[in-house]
Interface confidence: medium
Amino acid sequence: QAGPLPKPTLWAEPGSVISWGNSVTIWCQGTLEAREYRLDKEESPAPWDRQNPLEPKNKARFSIPSMTEDYAGRYRCYYRSPVGWSQPSDPLELVMTGAYSKPTLSALPSPLVTSGKSVTLLCQSRSPMDTFLLIKERAAHPLLHLRSEHGAQQHQAEFPMSPVTSVHGGTYRCFSSHGFSHYLLSHPSDPLELIVSGSLEDPRPSPTRSVSTAAGPEDQPLMPTGSVPHSGLRRHWE
């Protein structure tokens, strides 16, 4: 065979962000010539697991019946064909929520904001953390990642949005975590509905969805604008 074997595709169902205790299935899809599939987890002895292919041999299933901290991490898979092992798949990051108590998300001065004005979303945690994530429902990616400098332990992160437009309207949640494992997140905060008034179009309603639901492509990540917070937290765009 000319050249290396094509890399397989790796994904998780129902998604790659799973609540503690829930089940998740990792799928690795290769080619019809695959004889064996291997799953490697970063910083774990390789292989992490091996599976025979399911008919028609082009994919394998790796089951996690109950999500715990041990399963959170970065995975790659390979398949073996008669001519050897494939290239590794692109990595899959399996994130567990529920590792810490849920933070509180609030809007200052109010979740009802006039277009063109400013609002700050404030995520507060019971325990000191060094990383905070803000998620907008139906957005494709985590919106904003704030990590404190020098591992400073904070109880809050500020997400300023200015000037607010109708695009900012919608349902937000936040998570907190420790930098030593960004694969372990807190329970999600209760949802916060940001309502933007005084614009031509009202924000479209965002249905409540579970954290593990795969995000739809309809929203691009929304980047709050404004100055970097003075809270010792560094901004990371995702």
Partner: antibody
Framework: QVQLKESGPGLVQASETLSLTCTVS????????VNWVRQPSGKGPEWLGR???????VYNLTLESRLSISGDTSKNQVFLKMNRLRTDDTGTYYC???????????????WGQGTLVTVSS | ETVMTQSPTSLSASIGERVTLNCKAS??????VDWYQQTPGQSPKLLIY???NRHTGVPDRFTGSGFGSGFTLTISNVEPEDLGVYYC?????????FGPGTKLELK
Amino acid sequence: QVQLKESGPGLVQASETLSLTCTVSGFSLTSYCVNWVRQPSGKGPEWLGRFWYDEGKVYNLTLESRLSISGDTSKNQVFLKMNRLRTDDTGTYYCTRDRDTMGITGWFAYWGQGTLVTVSS
Amino acid sequence: ETVMTQSPTSLSASIGERVTLNCKASQSVGINVDWYQQTPGQSPKLLIYGSANRHTGVPDRFTGSGFGSGFTLTISNVEPEDLGVYYCLQYGSVPYTFGPGTKLELK
């Protein structure tokens, strides 16, 4: 009603270890956070650390190497141990409880009456 | 650590007067600021939590405000029992730190 009471020796020698007990009533240590705060005479309070049954312990980093906080939820008691005492550790030591079980704001809503600790050289 | 500064260091007020106490954090602490009152020989008493919320039983003449790094406590009509030292506390980041206090005296 919520009550916190500190107890321990009033006088300790420098370089020795201070052991204080905070006995609480009117609430469960499995639901609330208890903090230790000290106040040198005529000065402002200083936070030492906290005990939270399901969230772990957090210490003031400047004192962390000398401090140990633990709890016995069945006896409704939280303990503070501070070793290698110095004369500037003299002051009134308080235990406090947060305002509600959410533990987001109002960290020191309820205070004990405090216990005066004098470190002599 | 987050350093809290308070101003003024002390002030004299007449009964019924309106006074404003200021607290400044060296970095943003969100709304994670409480205000405490301490009278001689007593434990500090929580007045305001989360920057602007009155604790149970605190008279409505006490009002807190602020966000980020600037906070104020306003006493609208000073009463004799309001005399004492007022401390602000931040718990936005570890270690939690108190301000040095503002002493309120009677004119």
